[in-house]
Interface confidence: low
Amino acid sequence: MMTGTIETTGNISAKKGGSVILQCHLSSTMAQVTQVNWEQHDHSLLAIRNAELGWHIYPAFKDRVAPGPGLGLTLQSLTMNDTGEYFCTYHTYPDGTYRGRIFLEVLESSVAEHSARFQIP
């Protein structure tokens, strides 16, 4: 039985050219996290974090994506095309798969309202 829940940063916005952290947190379960996949709105994989073997950033994104903090993902040098949905998929044992959604809006404006907790200056 899957008892856990995924908490995410929800809907966030950030400045074009800036950086933002995508963060998901799995709570209310004792399941072991074996792998976390980060996917973009078109379902292409950005990065994978495997519990045993560490991080892999997919080649197409290696210049603009940095692993962490924690199981999160840092997007850098944001462009307007980065606007859209992002998904974290937690593969766990024995629960199975948990999935969280984040919506990122990249703004042209120099004023981007979002939680400072997840912003990198």
């Epitope: 792998q35 996949n37 996917e39 078109d42 379902h43 292409s44 994989l45 994978i48 495997n50 045993e52 073997l53 560490g54 892999h56 997919y58 080649p59 197409a60 593969h91």
Partner: antibody, heavy 119, light 107 residues
């Protein structure tokens, strides 16, 4: 250019063990992971397991746990797979394959080592 | 484990023809699919990863498409060197599994 050099055919007796090598060249050995793949009788491919040459961390297909053991020697840029308690079911071609990340997809392959288990 | 089902198991085609090979995953793998070509007695060679990204040096007559559970590899204007076996493989999460293969033969 990237090269993964494997030995020629091996003939071993049932119940014995064999250790197959895979010598890497043309890239930084510790920057990529090494996978092993089985192909039986010209049929499809089965992933056996993967090892991170930097840390020695390994990960196995459940089917091959206890059958295969993966190791590396960083000093010689060589990966090894030991297969034990051999039976005729283990007769196959075994490939080493460089893994982009820890085995996601395999961008360079060794030429394969044909293992025949027969008395 | 994710099961990859490839079809057809074999097909015959002539040089210049266009062929399509399909691969179905038993669960959603998004775009995490690779295609390999293998010639008789040789090792497999990576053609496509992330469902549609061609490996460097692979001719543009090859194209991959699909996402989720349904994928295909299309070869336009078949050349003599294209004949051999083709395998799909998911790269979504361990254990990584392959399709049963498609043998492409000259008609």
């Amino acid at each position: 250019q990237v090269q993964l050099q494997q030995p020629g055919p091996e003939l071993v007796k049932p119940g014995a063990s064999v250790k197959i090598s895979c010598k890497a060249s043309g890239y930084s050995f510790t920057d990529y992971n090494m996978n092993w793949v089985k192909q039986s009788n010209g049929k499809s491919l089965e992933w056996i397991g993967v090892i991170n040459p930097n840390s020695g961390t390994d990960n196995y297909n459940q089917k091959f746990k206890g059958k295969a053991t993966l190791t590396v020697d960083q000093s010689s840029s060589t990966a090894y797979m030991q297969l034990n308690s051999l039976t005729s079911e283990d007769s196959a071609v075994y490939f080493c394959a460089r893994g982009v990340y820890f085995g996601n997809y395999f961008d360079s392959w060794g030429q394969g080592t044909t293992l025949t288990v027969s008395s | 484990d994710i099961v990859m089902t490839q079809s057809p198991a074999s097909l015959s085609a002539s040089v210049g023809e266009t062929v399509t090979i399909t691969c179905r995953a038993s669960e959603n793998i998004y775009s995490s699919l690779a295609w390999y070509q293998q010639k008789q007695g040789k090792s497999p060679q990576l053609l496509v990863f992330n469902a549609k990204t061609l490996t460097e040096g692979v001719p543009s007559r090859f194209s991959g498409s699909g996402s989720g559970t349904q994928f295909s590899l299309k070869i336009n204007s078949l050349q003599p060197e294209d004949f051999g076996s083709y395998y799909c493989q998911h790269h979504y999460g361990a254990p990584w599994t392959f399709g049963g293969g498609t043998k492409l033969e000259i008609k």
